[in-house]
């Protein structure tokens, strides 16, 4: 498949026109514009698709005033102005505002709690498997295997801090060298970016919102992937991270510090610990080849235990089995030795829902996974709704200007760096990059923050999470201090290196362009978002893992041709857009390839056919589930969940609106509104209603 599906034969600017003229769809257009819209927008698509990539003819077909899908939407304030309200109205408005703020904070609280529970659920479902990934001996010699293990483990446990703490404990107990740990840390960095991508999927209901949210979330993914792509080979060749961090660790005489302050956890823990509590040591024990741990449950049962260390006399078959010669004796018949035994006395049970159910980890994990995703989705929808109602008119303008405006010349370049610091600071406060970037995602979706501004905030978040790790390392016990600090510093310098690569020069801000490209594709073919998630976070790492297990010869044998093809495609694409005349006529566009290799349309037909059975029932689901259904069946009518699909089918037949065209209305309600059937004010409410 060509790297930019169906773009090939058309436009040199992937940001604006992907998949034909998909890009022409306005993000959240004004009602006036929306009403006048007709199906004529289909016409230019065909024309553009037929043009070669270098053609200037596209300019003729372009509308004079292009609606850039990445322009932030104007959130109109339909309400009465403050000055026009009477005293009663003002008081009512004030209390409404307070109520909304309380609701917003409440939903935000449950949103963060559901992320925590989601992480616990993933650990219950895949934690033990994640631990077993670490016990693979090839990690030591194969950095690529280390990388994918880092990705897979972090994806499975939904927490980079869990995977890095496993790495730290393995390094401190000499099961792993720092050199072998660095690729795992890089992988953990990639794996942690899946959380906000999952959160972005929850905004699938509204095409333009989804475009921005998904791009905003995946900018983190692309930054991490690109950083690894460049820095892993550099690290393998030079070991610069290992050397720098070793010098730092050796030059300072660190004393054990205090624990990193738990700021957000203080608020969320009282609630989350009532749902489930996990014994995370089990995953570490499995990673360190502890056979007994494989049969242990991750669900914590006893919260208060008394540990008593005693020495007991035990019989041994022969003196060779003694702990030491001086601790060996006989009673005349049997040989005895002394062993240190730790007696664990259970005192009080934990106070959480699953404590007395004695369900297997997989069952508890599955229950929590479903529930946390539902709560996550519900909270997100409500947050977006409340923000949508609050951020209107003047308020929106002020906030958007504050967040997205640069400093005055000549200090404009400093704005991004301030955003990096803000991102780092906020992440340090919430103690989790996942929480911060996940909270950022809906804001990007509704158009409060631009992707250009979200990018440095995300980079800052990456830095913030490493400063937390450094503080945690300083609080480690003596034997683990050096290794945990060195690994935390490796993580820190890796992110710093990544920022230096992909931020200072605007031209190098590839992650933004790639994320926008993916956002455009996913907005048109919403199933592609799930496909991307599965491919990049599961299939590719699992494939590399499998090939690595087969041996480096197999890995090289398969990897080299794949890498060669990718480089070839990228070079060809670059030549097609920059200097096509150097290429033979046949290679000046992608038409020489069969359609399924250069476009997502045939694939879309397959997916549509496959999910067709869901499409009829899709809207009959409960309103929260509906969003998940929409994601699967890519049915733009889905968001109106109050009516069954039969009614919607009839409505659709009456209009003859192509279901798949991104230029058509995002849902049936809007299309009816465009024809004057539905009052304009209801449309958005109807679409994002719970």
């Amino acid at each position: 498949m060509a790297p930019w599906p169906e773009l090939g034969d058309a436009q040199p600017n992937p940001d604006k026109y992907l998949e034909g003229a998909a890009g022409q769809q306005p993000t959240a257009p004004d009602k006036s514009k929306e009403t006048n819209k007709t199906d004529n927008t289909e016409a230019p698509v065909t024309k553009i698709e037929l043009l070669p990539s270098y053609s200037t003819a596209t300019l003729i077909d372009e509308p004079t005033e292009v609606d850039d899908p990445w322009n932030l939407p104007t959130l109109q304030d339909s309400g009465i102005k403050w000055s026009e309200r009477d005293t009663k109205g003002k008081i009512l408005c004030f209390f409404q505002g307070i109520g909304r703020l309380i609701l917003l904070l409440g939903f935000l609280y449950f949103f963060v709690c559901s992320l925590d529970i989601l992480s616990s659920a993933f650990q219950l479902v895949g934690g033990k498997m994640a631990g077993q990934f670490f016990s693979n001996s090839s990690i030591m010699s194969n950095p690529l295997l280390g990388l994918v293990i880092g990705v897979l483990v972090t994806v499975l446990v939904q927490s980079s801090s869990t995977s890095t703490s496993i790495v730290v404990s393995m390094v401190s107990s000499s099961l792993l060298t720092v050199r072998a740990a660095i690729p795992i840390i890089m992988g953990a960095n990639i794996g942690t970016s899946i959380t906000n991508t999952i959160v972005a999927l929850m905004q699938v209901g509204d095409r333009s919102e989804f475009r921005r949210a998904f791009a905003g979330a995946t900018v983190h993914d692309f930054f991490n992937w690109l950083s690894v792509l460049v820095l892993l080979p550099v690290e393998v060749a030079t070991h610069y991270l290992e050397i720098i961090t070793q010098l730092i660790v050796e030059s300072f005489h660190f004393k054990n510090g205090e624990d990193a302050p738990d700021l957000l956890k203080v608020i969320t823990k009282p609630f989350t610990k009532l749902i489930v509590q996990l014994d995370k040591k089990v995953i570490s024990q499995i990673a360190m080849n502890d056979e007994k741990a494989k049969n242990k449950s991750l669900v914590k049962i006893w919260c208060k235990t008394f540990t008593n260390k005693t020495q007991i006399n035990v019989t041994v078959p022969s003196t060779a089995n003694c702990t030491s010669p001086s601790l060996c004796w006989t009673d005349g018949i049997q040989n005895w030795t002394m062993k240190n035994v730790t007696y664990k006395e259970n005192i009080a049970k934990c106070q959480h829902i699953f404590v007395n159910f004695h369900l297997p980890d997989l069952a508890v994990g599955t229950i929590l996974l479903i529930l946390s995703l539902l709560v996550l989705c519900g909270c997100l929808i409500m947050i977006v709704k409340i923000l949508g109602s609050v951020l209107k008119g003047q308020v929106a303008t002020v906030i958007k200007k504050t967040i997205n405006t640069d400093f005055p010349f000549p200090f404009a370049w400093l704005t991004g760096y301030l955003a990096i610091l803000v991102g780092a600071g906020m992440t340090f406060i919430v103690q989790s990059s996942s929480v911060f970037t996940s909270a950022l995602t809906p804001l990007i979706g509704i158009g409060v923050i631009t992707i250009e501004r979200a990018y440095p905030l995300t980079l800052g978040s990456n830095i913030g999470t490493t400063t937390t790790a450094i503080l945690a390392a300083l609080a480690s016990p003596g034997n683990a201090l050096r290794s945990s600090l060195q690994i935390a510093l490796c993580h820190f310098f890796f992110n710093i290196s990544g920022i230096l690569l992909w931020y200072p020069i605007p031209f190098t801000r590839l992650p933004i362009r790639m994320a926008k490209g993916l956002g455009n594709i996913s907005a048109k073919y919403r199933w592609f978002a799930v496909f991307y998630l599965i491919i990049f976070f599961f299939l590719i790492p699992l494939t590399v893992f499998g090939l690595s297990l087969a041996g480096w010869r197999v890995l090289v044998g398969v990897g080299v041709p794949v890498v060669f093809i990718i480089i070839l495609v990228l070079c060809l694409r670059l030549l097609q857009s920059r200097c096509p005349r150097v290429l033979p006529k046949k290679l000046q566009n992608w038409n020489f390839l069969p359609l399924w290799m250069r476009s997502l349309k045939p694939w879309d037909a397959v997916v549509s056919k496959f999910t067709g059975c869901f499409q009829m029932r899709c809207c009959c689901c409960c309103r929260v589930c509906c969003r998940a259904c929409c994601l699967l069946c890519d049915c733009p009518k889905c968001c109106r969940c109050s009516k069954c699909c039969e009614d919607l089918e009839e409505a659709q037949e009456g209009q003859d609106v192509p279901v798949k065209a991104p230029e058509t209305f995002d849902n049936i309600t809007i299309s009816r509104e465009a024809q004057g059937e539905v009052p304009a004010s209801d449309s958005k409410t109807e679409c994002t209603a719970l």
Epitope: C328, W329, T330, D331, G332, I333, Q334, W336
Partner: antibody, heavy 119, light 107 residues
């Protein structure tokens, strides 16, 4: 209280066998090892072997292997030590001693049985 | 077999004296050493086990120390009833062995 009562003195001819008994009381018979130690006139103590009445497991000093047999009768809480192929140098006082649980120190001793081997 | 060598073999002392007997093992026995007291015509009596632990009912004037290959047995203040023969025993490995004994006599 713990008591170990041994059988009376024996006079044996060389080549004969002797069986000394040791009746115990005051503790759980099957929990402790029972050791046999001998002391030749004017000499030091010499360990012959031990038996664990709970299972009947025995351990003998290599010096006496093949000549000594230790048995236990749990019904009467009595242990027996039989020494065969007696020689004049086997003349000694034979003691039964209870081993402390889990190690080889002997906390309670019988009064001793004098075995005299002479032609 | 592990050999135990007690010294001295004979010791003369007066009531109230502090007496020390040593026991050397031919190899490391850890702390698996016991001390016994035997009076003429009587059975041995356990005084010390695990090199330093007094058996129940044993007066605290009796003490033991040492580990590895060198052990000492001390009577801090001799009493008239303490005049007897003292044996050390190792139970580090089979066969259990005893020292040749130290005879403590009245000076």
């Amino acid at each position: 209280q713990v008591q170990l009562v041994q059988s009376g003195a024996e006079v044996k001819k060389p080549g004969a066998s002797v069986k000394v008994s040791c009746k115990t009381s005051g503790y759980t018979f099957t929990t402790n090892n029972m050791h046999w130690v001998r002391q030749a006139p004017g000499q030091g103590l010499e360990w012959i072997g031990a038996i664990y009445p709970g299972s009947g497991a025995t351990a003998y000093n290599q010096k006496f292997k093949g000549r000594v047999t230790m048995t236990a009768d749990t019904s009467t809480s009595t242990v027996y030590m039989e020494l065969s192929s007696l020689r004049s140098e086997d003349t000694a006082v034979y003691y039964c001693a209870r081993g402390m649980y889990g190690h080889g120190a002997m906390d309670y001793w019988g009064q001793g049985t004098l075995v005299t081997v002479s032609s | 077999d592990i050999q135990l060598t007690q010294s001295p073999s004979f010791l003369s002392a007066s009531v109230g004296d502090r007496v020390t007997i040593t026991c050397k093992a031919s190899q490391d026995v850890g702390t698996a050493v016991a001390w016994y007291q035997q009076k003429p015509g009587k059975s041995p009596k356990l005084l010390i086990y695990w090199a330093t632990t007094r058996h129940s009912g044993v007066p605290d004037r009796f003490s033991g120390s040492g580990s590895g290959t060198e052990f000492t047995f001390t009577i801090s203040s001799l009493q008239p009833e303490d005049f007897a023969t003292y044996f050390c025993q190792q139970y580090s490995s089979n066969p259990l062995t005893f020292g040749q004994g130290t005879k403590l006599e009245i000076k």
